[in-house]
Interface confidence: low
Amino acid sequence: PEPPTACREKQYLINSQCCSLCQPGQKLVSDCTEFTETECLPCGESEFLDTWNRETHCHQHKYCDPNLGLRVQQKGTSETDTICTCEEGWHCTSEACESCVLHRSCSPGFGVKQIATGVSDTICEPCPVGFFSNVSSAFEKCHPWTSCETKDLVVQQAGTNKTDVVCGPQDRLRA
């Protein structure tokens, strides 16, 4: 018969014949021949291959380097790579998550609009009129000024975006 020019899915063409690809999780040891099947070998403990392949080497699992703030989110298998994520309080610097940076804190005068996640930083917003933040925090929102009136007090010192109002007793009206 004529030698094939194309092969079926999960096969590859070599020496004018179609050989089976190795399944995910296995690497190629030797091509098939007229008399033998493709020889494949499972990937080692810290290795993987995630596609039907003819690779002679498996890929190393990603290392989640704790020095870069990384930890394992999902352990790799022979068919999947390790997925890294960031330690609590840190977030990835990219979609590939090859390193992490500390979540930003919002300075006094700014409050947290959105708390950071493993993949995005803290989003801060300036405290609008009527609100304040007197701390540097990655969690605290802007707090509303104290309402002196509801406490039967009067404003003795106006609030700012960094300080609360200061309330004091009302001046007694003389009879």
Epitope: D50, T51, H59, D81, C92, S94, E95, A96, L102, V119
Partner: antibody
Framework: DVQLQESGPDRVKPSQSLSLTCTVT?????????WHWIRQFPGNKLEWMGY???????YYNPSLKSRISFTRDTSKNQFFLQLNSVTTEDTATYYC????????????WGRGTTLTVSS | QIVLTQSPAIMSASPGEKVTLTCSAS?????MHWYQQKSGTSPKRWIY???KLASGVPARFSGSGSGTSYSLTISSMEAEDAATYYC?????????FGAGTKLELK
């Protein structure tokens, strides 16, 4: 609206160093996100060169790691690309871009600056 | 590194025709992103996170796929869609782009 503008020489001799500047307006480069350099060769192939993060952390494409560096001037809201030992293969249009991680794509690109490496 | 192979490299489509561009990754990726570039301009975000349209992108565009196989589809080709489209991944470093598909109007 965030805008990025590349600037630098349009011609460099082989073996020299290349320095490009990206000036950002409308957003502070120290606030968040990652700030990237990407180049496009004459045949239109795009190559990602790496990025400098808002914290100052850098990551370089391993294919360029030995001759590339990114720095920034936060007071001018600029970040810089330096590429050493250039060859004619470095002839390309160089873009700076912002990548909003969490939105997962390059949202804003500069217009690009065209560099020719020739003697 | 993950190699992205786009096909076809060049294609022509008539107005109203359905168009599918494909992007094949050498290893599995979590998401695929697509950019449109017209001559003399920088690439524009077009489809991100595999299937989400960037703002201003007409609804005739759609994206789909998973693992190693992704596609961008135009349900009905229009003259303004003639451009080069690039796929991009960042599931693994380094970030990589496909070589692009140049889509021409027939």
């Amino acid at each position: 609206d965030v805008q990025l503008q590349e600037s630098g020489p349009d011609r460099v001799k082989p073996s020299q160093s290349l320095s490009l500047t990206c000036t950002v307006t409308g957003y502070s480069i120290t606030s968040d996100y990652s700030w990237h350099w990407i180049r496009q060769f004459p045949g239109n192939k795009l190559e990602w060169m790496g990025y400098i993060y808002s914290s100052g952390h850098t990551y370089y494409n391993p294919s360029l790691k030995s001759r590339i560096s990114f720095t920034r001037d936060t007071s001018k809201n600029q970040f810089f690309l330096q590429l050493n030992s250039v060859t004619t293969e470095d002839t390309a249009t160089y873009y700076c871009a912002i990548y909003y991680y969490g939105r997962s794509y390059f949202d804003n690109w500069g217009r690009g600056t065209t560099l020719t490496v020739s003697s | 590194q993950i190699v992205l192979t786009q096909s076809p490299a060049i294609m022509s489509a008539s107005p109203g025709e359905k168009v599918t561009l494909t992007c094949s990754a050498s290893s599995s990726v979590n998401y695929m992103h697509w950019y449109q570039q017209k001559s003399g301009t920088s690439p524009k975000r077009w489809i991100y996170d595999t299937s989400k349209l960037a703002s201003g992108v007409p609804a005739r565009f759609s994206g789909s796929g998973s693992g190693t196989s992704y596609s961008l589809t135009i349900s009905s080709m229009e003259a303004e869609d003639a451009a080069t489209y690039y796929c991009q991944q960042w599931s693994s470093n380094p970030l990589t782009f496909g070589a692009g598909t140049k889509l021409e109007l027939k």
